[in-house]
């Protein structure tokens, strides 16, 4: 018979026949052969190979090293790497999450529009007109000004992005 | 047969030191990750320290962070936690467990040595 | 840190009834590369360390009796223990062995009516 030129899902062409590819966890020793199966062993503790595949050494599961501020989020097994996060307070420098940075605070002026989470930054937003914040933060939002009418005051001083109004007695009308 | 076996428990003063061993056979120890468990005196079980097979990742609990200290010497078929600034919170049965690359669990385990710390 | 809540915290049994024994954690263990929920079952009898019983939530792990049996996934677990014998008397502890700090429940223990 002709020799296969291509070879069914999970397979591989080699030596010009079809060999089975082995499982995830699983790497090559060695080919198929026209009487023999492919050989397979399994991933050693702390490898991983993710996919069907004719790898002759495994992956090393990545270290989620506290000292860069890495946690695990999802251990590693014989299938799939570990991944990585941050610990509270910092974020992911990158998508692999290699390192973490700490979160970004809004200045004041400038209000939490999105908390950071393990893997994104702070996301600031400038106070707008009726709003304000005097702190430096990761959390904290814009606030409204104090409503003085609602409190039979009035605006003695008028609000910044940075601080809020200042509400006094009405002036009596002396008599 | 696969044994585990733990040693150098004992009786240890608030802010003394102690070296926990765990000496395995019956198996080839530098396959095996390996962990150490505690479980203080009629309470439930709580992870320590894990260590990989090649020594290259190592985790501890936040409790122990610091203070301890795991390492192996697969030359010797040998566990060690080195435990410093020790507190009465650390009296516990130390077991010593071991986790292979397939299922990822702890599928051994010591029979334990008791880390009693006391005045 | 994942928190594993067992309930009930202990049971009295009779030999040959049949013992379920429920496990939550605080968030899931569903691994999303295989799709395996990492929930184990050691079994701790007097005077003895933990031995494992079930890994992967329902893989019973070589020589445990066939009348044991996990179930669950995600955050809800439960071991089951049909025709209870003498010699399962013991405490019974979940565990999430699906990430780092690797956490386990408070236990289970059964005890002779």
């Known amino acids: 018979p002709e020799p296969p030129t291509a070879c069914r899902e999970k397979q591989y062409l080699i030596n010009s026949q079809c060999c089975s590819l082995c499982q995830p966890g699983q790497k090559l020793v060695s080919d198929c052969t026209e009487f023999t199966e492919t050989e397979c062993l399994p991933c050693g503790e702390s490898e991983f190979l993710d996919t069907w595949n004719r790898e002759t050494h495994c992956h090393q599961h990545k270290y989620c090293d506290p000292n860069l501020g890495l946690r695990v989020q999802q251990k590693g097994t014989s299938e799939t790497d570990t991944i990585c996060t941050c610990e509270e307070g910092w974020h992911c420098t990158s998508e692999a999450c290699e390192s973490c940075v700490l979160h970004r605070s809004c200045s004041p002026g400038f209000g939490v529009k999105q908390i950071a989470t393990g893997v994104s930054d702070t996301i600031c937003e400038p106070c707008p007109v009726g709003f304000f914040s005097n702190v430096s933060s990761a959390f904290e939002k814009c606030h409204p000004w104090t409503s003085c009418e609602t409190k039979d005051l009035v605006v003695q001083q008028a609000g910044t992005n940075k601080t809020d109004v200042v509400c006094g007695p009405q002036d009596r009308l002396r008599a | 047969e696969v044994q585990l076996v733990e040693s150098g428990g004992g009786l240890v003063k608030p802010g003394g030191s102690r070296r926990l061993s765990c000496a395995a056979s019956?198996?080839?120890?530098?396959?095996?990750?390996m962990h150490w468990v505690r479980q203080a005196p009629g309470k439930g079980l709580e992870w320590v320290a894990y260590?990989?097979?090649?020594?290259?990742?190592?985790y501890y609990a936040d409790t122990v962070k610091g203070r301890f200290t795991i390492s192996r010497d697969n030359a010797k078929n040998s566990l060690y936690l080195q435990m410093n600034s020790l507190r009465a919170e650390d009296t516990a049965v130390y077991y010593c467990?071991?986790?292979?690359?397939?299922?990822?669990?702890?599928?051994?385990w010591g029979q334990g040595t008791l880390v009693t710390v006391s005045s | 840190d994942i928190v594993m809540t067992q309930s009930p915290s202990s049971l009295t049994v009779t030999a040959g009834e049949k013992v379920t024994m429920s496990c939550k954690s605080s968030?899931?263990?569903?691994?999303?590369?295989?799709?395996?929920?990492?929930l184990t079952w050691h079994q701790q009898k007097p005077g003895q360390p933990p031995k494992l019983l079930i890994y992967?939530?329902?893989t019973r792990e070589s020589g445990v009796p066939d009348r044991f049996t996990g179930s669950g996934s995600g955050t809800d677990f439960t071991l089951t223990i049909s025709n209870l014998q003498a010699e399962d008397l013991a405490v019974y502890y979940c565990?999430?062995?699906?990430?780092?700090?690797?956490?386990f429940g408070a236990g289970t223990k059964l005890e002779l009516k």
């Open positions: 467990a071991r986790q292979d690359g397939y299922r990822y669990a702890m599928d051994y």
């Open positions: 019956g198996f080839t120890f530098s396959d095996y990750g």
């Open positions: 260590i990989s097979s090649g020594n290259r990742i190592i």
């Open positions: 968030q899931s263990l569903l691994n999303s590369g295989n799709q395996k929920n990492y």
């Open positions: 992967w939530t329902s």
């Open positions: 565990q999430n062995d699906y990430t780092y700090p690797l956490t």
